[in-house]
Structures are given as structure tokens and as C-alpha cells.
């Protein structure tokens, strides 16, 4: 308990053999000789009290009764610490000129306290003297009297028997253990402009510090230093900056040292690297300095925008690392000579030149327009003019072709593409006009006749294993019967396709070759003729003229032209009444036969039941004599659409009686209108 009583709770720990050695406790009692009795005359007693380092002594009186005399000249108790007299005490209570301790507590200045008691040769009455108690206690070095310098620069930490200092982030404790020196070396500035200042600016800068700041810019830049706001660095009236100073060093020269209160002038270093050194000593209270630095470089020639272009950003001048871009007006494009640029940005180099030459903003040129198959192009704006906003007009070869997709007017747009009024960049399409014929029908039914040029310009002669026919659709498809080309479905190139001729054996014809054969998936060879329809894709488009013209496909409304007794025309080089293939293209006008009547005609042997299906139509005379025959297979049974005045294919020559033109039997044709979706799908997909 003694330890705790005298030294307080020492951080709650007790000395251990391995732990720190606590100082021996210092405490006790002092009293005048003979206390509590009266003290004798001519007494002199001296006590020297000593506490461990870092501790002080506290003393207070529990009893004090001494003779009172002027300035305590007779009897007194004197308290001293080192050379300093803390108090001279006498009497019982303090007066104007004498002091008695009362309830005061006295503290040594250091770790020692001297107490002297003296009585003179006489006392007028008896005095009982004094009783005092003392103890050692920790000094709180961190507490300082007002006006005194603080113990530590930044943070002070008291502990039993001593104290220590610590520093804020960015500082380090000096060797003197009290001063905080700034950690201010090795700061590097690489931006083209910035600010730097003494530590803590505009508050006083730290003591005992050595700061270095480096400005390091790319070669070609020159640093400019401007001192701003205020400048206050400790100075001396006679010696140049002996205490604190600022120096500026470049690869060319040294500026400074600077100190005092006057802002130094601007420094144009003509260097891309600058080192600023700031050194402070252990004393002083000055606010320091602030520098705003900028940089410059050899400017590049001012960029003049090319015609029809503009520069961005616009600056008063362009120096090293500055850049500009060129943007062209709508309808103009960036060109470096002949080379188109997606974008253009030039950067100013250290020698004062741009890293690339100025491009041109040249008017967009869409170039010569593509040729239009079966059409032509006309320059509207001017002969051969193909630049921005130029207009061209496509047209199709008259009579035999008509334009699809758009009106054929195209404008050269800013993206460099010829563009239609609908925004299409692809060419229009010259689609062959279908269903044109030189023939006029009187409507009477009469015997097979020779066709004249231009009567059946859609007529196609197909030579493969046998002779067959077909009808031209568009300019690269042939519609025919599945049974006519079934054997060649896997060898399309074996088909010899001829058109534009009337004479079967004539050497004067337009040759076409097959690229692919598409047989209806519902057709079964040698098992009836349902879905007897096929398409042949030609490997090249044929040129349309008066002798080669496609047949039209039936419109939705076409049924109204194919009712019972309506006249259709079949044509071909098939067998004639004489039993031979026709040399000249023949045709016959025949009426459509009632479907039930036709079905019934083919229900008796040798025809299997259900031979005539809803995908077929029949035509011919009940009396016979007018019919299509072998060799005509695949040819078109055509009808005139009186609204459009165009011929369309209503049927495909498919099958009939064993003897062509037999009375009571009819020619059976594939009903094309049932296959429009199939035809359109094949053609659009392939």
C-alpha cells in the first residue's frame, strides 16, 4: 500500500522482476524542533529533499506558528528549489509584507527542495513552530504557463517520471526530441502548372526543416515561377539569410537565397527542371511563401483551318503538347492527299512544329454510280458530277423493264453513298415487264395454229432427257412441270434451255443454263400428278426483248378470269395430230372445263380414282380435237387479265388422256394460283 499511497496509481501496474524498476517512494514529515512544544531560540535546521528525475516535490503545512517580524527577519521557514527561493514564511497569517503558508501547497521547480528553519535569539512569547508533509509527485511537463514556449512542437505525452513528443503526419521528430521537422523533401511536380508553398502556409512554417521541391516537365517546356500572396522568411539586418532561406536551382543557374518580407520577382527559368530548397532553423515564427508556377514552350505556327473546315479548340497560341482537331463541314471529308482520315488531331512538338500536316476538307465524292442491270443512269447535276448533293437518275430500259423499290432518283450524301429519296443505298431494280404479247385474241375457239414472233415470248424449250416446255418468270426463273424435269433435279446443268425462238430446231435462239431445279416437295414421281410444279433458276439473267418476255403470275383477283368456259391458251412444240413434235411453236385456245365434270371424266378406268385434285384445272373441248400433248409438258396455259391487259399463267401443262384431244377427256393443268406462296418463297430465298 505504501507505493500506491505515495506515488498514486502508477498506470495500474506493479513492478515485476522483469518489468521496469520503479523509483523508491519519497514522502515524509517535517517539524520544527520540539514540536508540538515551543521551539528554542537560535535554532537553524536544514532539510534537503530529493525526488527521482521527472518528479517534483509537493509540500504543505498542517501547523504553522512562528514569530512574526518585518519581512520575516527574525524567525522564518525558507523554501528553495535550486537557486530560486520559493517562499520565506513567518507568523500565523499573511500580512502585506509577510507570508504565512495557510493552506497553500508548495512545489519544487525541479526534483529537489531545500527547507531551512531559523529562530533568532529571543521570542517575546512562546511559538509552537510548524509541522509539514511532503511527497514526490510526477511533473506534468506538458503543462506550461501562459506565455511560455510549449514543451513540444506538436503533441506532448506526459508519463510518470517524464514525457515525450510526437509529430503530426508529414513531420518527423528532430534529434532534440522536441521539434517537429517537416517531411518535405522529394516532392515532384510534373503538371504544366501548379502551386507549391512552405509547409503549413499561411501558418508559420516548421522549424529545423529542410524541404526540396522539384518541378520536372517534359523537355521543351520552360518553367515560370511567380511568388504570390505573401512572403515572410526569417531574415537578419546585416547577414544575408543566415537563419532560414529559400533557394531555386535550375540546370542553368541558381536564384537566391531569398528571405525577408518582400515578394521576390517572377523567375523565368528557361529550364524544364527546377529544384526549390527551403531550409529553416530552430527558432522564429514566420508564415513562409507560396509559388504559383506555369510553363511555356516554343509556340507552333497558328493552325489555319482548311477551306470548309474548322479548328477546335481555338486558342490564342499552341505550345508543346497542345493539340487541335479539324472538323469538316457537312458534305466534306478529311483527306490527307488522297487518303481519307476518320479524324485528325495534330500535337505541337518541342521544336515548335506540328507532328502532322494540315489535312484538306474535300467535298465528299460518291464516285461513279454503279451500273444498273437493264437500266441506265443519267447525271442530273452536270456531266460526271459525283460530289456531295449531286443528283443522278436511274431509269430502266423502256417497254420491257419497270423500276421497283424507288423512283430511281439518288443524291450523293455526306456519308459518300448514293442514296434514294427513301434512304436506300442499294440500287433500284429493273424488273422485266411481264405478260406482254404481240397476239390479240378474238375469243373464238379454233384449231391449233402456228405462233407468230412475239406471240408467246415467255415460251421456253427445255431439252433434257425429253422435250418439254416452260414459261419464263422474271428474267432468271423458269416455271415448268415437276414431271418434266424430275430426272434432272440433281443434275441441273444437264438441262438445255432455249428461248426467243419459234422454230424448235432453229440455231437462232437465246441459250440459258440451269443453276438449280426446285421440285415441289409434295410431288411424288410416278404416283399421280398432284403438285406437278417446278422452278428452274437460271445461272444468268436473260435480256428481255419483244421475243423474250416473262409471263405474269396470277393476281389474287385472277380467279375471275379463269372460270368455267373462260378461254386460256396453251402453246408448245408437242405432238401434233400427225403424231410428230411440231417444228414451229403451236398454240391452241381452249376453254376451262367444270372441275366436277373433269373429275368424273377421269374416274373411270384406266385412271385411278382421285386422279384430278383441287390443285389441278382442266381445259379442252368436250368434242375433243383441241388439246396439249406430249412435248408440251411444263408449258403455260395463259389467260389475259383484262384489267391489267397482261397475260398471266393460270396452268402448267401436266397430264391428260393417253390419246391427246380425245372426246370426253380434257387436258389437266397444274393450278398455279394455289402455288403463289411456294413460288414467291423459292424466288425470294434463292
Amino acid at each position: 500500500m505504501r507505493l500506491l499511497t505515495l506515488l498514486g496509481l502508477l498506470c495500474g501496474s506493479v513492478a515485476t522482476p522483469l518489468g521496469p524498476k520503479w523509483p523508491e517512494p519519497v514522502f515524509g514529515r517535517l517539524a520544527s524542533p520540539g514540536f508540538p512544544g515551543e521551539y528554542a531560540n537560535d535554532q537553524e535546521r536544514r532539510w534537503t529533499l530529493t525526488a527521482p528525475p521527472g518528479y517534483r516535490l509537493r509540500l504543505y503545512f498542517t501547523h504553522f506558528d512562528l514569530e512574526l517580524s518585518h519581512l520575516c527577519e527574525y524567525d522564518f521557514v525558507k523554501l528553495s528549489s535550486g537557486a530560486k527561493v520559493l517562499a520565506t514564511l513567518c507568523g500565523q497569517e499573511s500580512t502585506d509584507t509577510e507570508r504565512a503558508p495557510g493552506k497553500d501547497t508548495f512545489y519544487s521547480l525541479g526534483s529537489s527542495l531545500d527547507i531551512t528553519f531559523r529562530s533568532d535569539y529571543s521570542n517575546e512569547k512562546p511559538f509552537t513552530g510548524f509541522e509539514a508533509f511532503y511527497a514526490a509527485e510526477d511533473i506534468d511537463e506538458c503543462q506550461v504557463a501562459p506565455g511560455e514556449a510549449p514543451t513540444c512542437d506538436h503533441h506532448c505525452h506526459n508519463h510518470l517520471g517524464g514525457f515525450y513528443c510526437s509529430c503530426r503526419a508529414g513531420y518527423v521528430l528532430h534529434r532534440n526530441k522536441r521539434t517537429c521537422s517537416a517531411l518535405c523533401s522529394g516532392q515532384v511536380f510534373t503538371q504544366r502548372s501548379g502551386e507549391l508553398s512552405s509547409p503549413e502556409y499561411p501558418r508559420p512554417y516548421p522549424k529545423l526543416s529542410s524541404c526540396t521541391y522539384s518541378i520536372s516537365l517534359e523537355e521543351g517546356f520552360s518553367v515560370i515561377l511567380d511568388f504570390v500572396e505573401s512572403f515572410d522568411v526569417e531574415t537578419h539586418p546585416e547577414t544575408l539569410c543566415p537563419y532560414d532561406f529559400l533557394k531555386i536551382q535550375t540546370d542553368r543557374e541558381e536564384h537566391g537565397p531569398f528571405c525577408g518580407k518582400t515578394l521576390p520577382h517572377r523567375i523565368e527559368t528557361k529550364s524544364n527542371t527546377v529544384t526549390i530548397t527551403f531550409v529553416t532553423d530552430e527558432s522564429g515564427d514566420h508564415t513562409g511563401w507560396k509559388i504559383h508556377y506555369t510553363s511555356t514552350a516554343q509556340p507552333c505556327p497558328y493552325p489555319m483551318a482548311p477551306p470548309n473546315g474548322h479548328v477546335s479548340p481555338v486558342q490564342a497560341k499552341y505550345i508543346l503538347k497542345d493539340s487541335f482537331s479539324i472538323f469538316c463541314e457537312t458534305g466534306y471529308e478529311l483527306l490527307q492527299g488522297h487518303l481519307p482520315l476518320k479524324s485528325f488531331t495534330a500535337v505541337c512538338q518541342k521544336d515548335g512544329s506540328w507532328d502532322r500536316p494540315m489535312p484538306a476538307c474535300s467535298i465528299v465524292d460518291c464516285g461513279p454510280p454503279d451500273d444498273l442491270p437493264s437500266g441506265r443512269v443519267e447525271y442530273i447535276t452536270g456531266p460526271g458530277v459525283t460530289t456531295y448533293k449531286a443528283v443522278i437518275q436511274y431509269s430502266c430500259e423502256e417497254t420491257f423493264y419497270t423500276m421497283k423499290v424507288n423512283d430511281g432518283k439518288y443524291v450523293c450524301e455526306a456519308d459518300g453513298f448514293w442514296t434514294s429519296s427513301k434512304g436506300e443505298k442499294s440500287l433500284p431494280v429493273c424488273e422485266p415487264v411481264c405478260g406482254l404479247s404481240a397476239r390479240t385474241t378474238g375469243g373464238r375457239i379454233y384449231g391449233g395454229q402456228k405462233a407468230k414472233p412475239g406471240d408467246f415470248p415467255w415460251q421456253v424449250l427445255i431439252l433434257g432427257g425429253t422435250t418439254a416446255a416452260g414459261a419464263l418468270l422474271y428474267d432468271n426463273w423458269v416455271l415448268t412441270a415437276a414431271h418434266a424435269v424430275y430426272e434432272q433435279k440433281h443434275d441441273a446443268s444437264a438441262l438445255d434451255i432455249r428461248m426467243g425462238t419459234l422454230k424448235r430446231l432453229s440455231p437462232h435462239y437465246t441459250q440459258a443454263w440451269s443453276e438449280a431445279v426446285f421440285i415441289h416437295e409434295g410431288y411424288t414421281h410416278d404416283a399421280g400428278f398432284d403438285n406437278d410444279i417446278a422452278l428452274i433458276k437460271l445461272n444468268n439473267k436473260v435480256v428481255i426483248n419483244s421475243n423474250i418476255t416473262p409471263i405474269c403470275l396470277p393476281r389474287k383477283e385472277a380467279e375471275s378470269f379463269m372460270r368455267t368456259d373462260d378461254i386460256g391458251t396453251a402453246s408448245g412444240w408437242g405432238l401434233t395430230q400427225r403424231g410428230f413434235l411440231a417444228r414451229n411453236l403451236m398454240y391452241v385456245d381452249i376453254p376451262i372445263v367444270d372441275h366436277q365434270k373433269c373429275t368424273a371424266a377421269y374416274e373411270k378406268p384406266p385412271y385411278p380414282r382421285g386422279s384430278v385434285t383441287a390443285n389441278m384445272l382442266c381445259a379442252g373441248l368436250e368434242s375433243g380435237g383441241k388439246d396439249s400433248c406430249r412435248g408440251d409438258s411444263g408449258g403455260a396455259l395463259v389467260f389475259l387479265d383484262s384489267e391489267t391487259e397482261r397475260w398471266f399463267v393460270g396452268g402448267i401443262v401436266s397430264w391428260g388422256s393417253m390419246n391427246c384431244g380425245e372426246a370426253g377427256q380434257y387436258g389437266v393443268y397444274t393450278k398455279v394460283i394455289n402455288y403463289i406462296p411456294w413460288i414467291e418463297n423459292i424466288i425470294s430465298d434463292f
Partner: antibody
């Protein structure tokens, strides 16, 4: 039609400068780049650089950068190529050419022979 | 710089016979827009050069169709289907995709 007519032959001493002109006609001068190409006697062709008369912006091959200056006078549709600090190996025929969108060598001047001799 | 290498450097040909000149570049001449900027020039004796072919294979106006160009990337060929007397001269390939523009050494075509 497009024509490029160059100035006449020159004889120069080493260290001197020469300025060759190229007068353009038959098109809008400021719309097309002018290139300069040289051909030493019995040797191949060498591209020196170009200038765009519309902005007077020039670009030179690194080999000639320090010695060549290309300029234009748009008022008379003429391009100039000045070569300084002449050496004997600068003896060559100097051609101006006009480009189009397909390349810089669509049209050629007739050439100017520059002889450098002491 | 892009190096253009022509072969052969000398090409003796019989009149009416075909001729072929090869030109190889040290790097691809394909530009970012998908075009290849390679030209062929003809220089007849005592004359200025003239362009025969641009963009590898396109003939300049007035150039006979017996001349043709082909190739891609870094490998190109100029062909003359039937050499005529007026075809005598030096033929240069030149790349105009990369700066600086560079020429081949030239191929001298002469009649055997």
C-alpha cells in the same frame, strides 16, 4: 484539261539554293495537292513532299525536311519548291505532280533539270 | 520507310509476247478504308513518268487494256498481255498508303 508547266533548267553552285515553279491550269488549283518528285540522272524516283494550296499546309519527306520549302501563290495557280544548301548529289530532274482521290501521281509536269556543279 | 522491291530489273520481251513485273512491299499497303493504294507508272525514254494503274488494278483513262494490275497486301504484279513497241521504257511501282511515299527501283522493259 489538267496541265502542269514547270520552269526551265537551272545550273547552281554547291551551297546555293534553287526555286522551281509549277504553273497549274485546267482545274481549281486550291482543290488538289501538289507533290514534288525528283529523279537523279539514270536513277529512280524519289518523293520529296507535298503542299495543299487550299491551306498552304506542306509535308516533307524526313530526308528533305531541313532543306526544302514548298509554297504556293494561289493568285497565279503556281506552286514552288525551293531547295537550299545544294550539293552535287541534288543534280536531278524535279517533277511536280497533281494528285486525285486515287493517289498523288495522276498528272505530271514536264520536269525541271537542276544541275549542281562548281 | 516502306521498301518497294521490283523484279526483274531488266525485262527483254519479244513483240506480241506477254510480260510480267513483280513488286513486293516491306509491309501491307492495305489502308484503313479497305483500299490498297498501289500505283504503276510508265516512263518512256526521255519523257515524264505517267500513271498507268491505281488502286492495284484500275486503269487510268487512255491506258490500253493490254495492261493489267493485280495483287493484294504486299505482293503485286503488272502484266502486259501482248507487248508493243510503244511499251518500251521503265516501269515503277509506287506505294502511296504510308508516308513517305516510296517507289520501286524500276524495271526496264526492252524489245528482244
Amino acid at each position: 484539261q489538267v496541265q502542269l508547266v514547270q520552269s526551265g533548267a537551272e545550273v547552281k553552285k554547291p551551297g546555293a539554293s534553287v526555286k522551281v515553279s509549277c504553273k497549274a491550269s485546267g482545274y481549281t488549283f486550291t482543290d488538289y495537292y501538289i507533290n514534288w518528285v525528283r529523279q537523279a540522272p539514270g536513277q529512280g524516283l524519289e518523293w520529296m513532299g507535298w503542299i495543299f494550296p487550299g491551306s498552304e499546309s506542306a509535308y516533307h519527306s524526313e530526308k528533305f525536311k531541313a532543306r526544302v520549302t514548298m509554297t504556293v501563290d494561289t493568285s497565279i495557280s503556281t506552286a514552288y519548291m525551293e531547295l537550299s544548301r545544294l550539293r552535287s548529289d541534288d543534280t536531278a530532274v524535279y517533277y511536280c505532280t497533281r494528285g486525285d482521290r486515287s493517289g498523288p501521281f495522276a498528272y505530271w509536269g514536264q520536269g525541271t533539270l537542276v544541275t549542281v556543279s562548281s | 520507310d516502306v521498301v518497294m522491291t521490283q523484279s526483274p530489273l531488266s525485262l527483254p520481251v519479244t513483240l506480241g509476247q506477254p510480260a510480267s513485273i513483280s513488286c513486293k512491299s516491306s509491309q501491307s499497303l492495305l489502308y484503313s478504308n479497305g483500299k490498297t493504294y498501289l500505283n504503276w507508272l510508265q516512263q518512256r525514254p526521255g519523257q515524264s513518268p505517267r500513271r498507268l494503274i491505281y488502286l492495284v488494278s484500275k486503269l487510268d483513262s487512255g491506258v490500253p487494256d493490254r495492261f493489267s494490275g493485280s495483287g493484294s497486301g504486299a505482293d503485286f504484279t503488272l502484266k502486259i498481255s501482248r507487248v508493243e513497241a510503244e511499251d518500251v521504257g521503265v516501269y515503277y511501282c509506287v506505294q502511296v498508303t504510308h508516308f513517305p511515299f516510296t517507289f520501286g527501283q524500276g524495271t526496264k522493259l526492252e524489245i528482244k
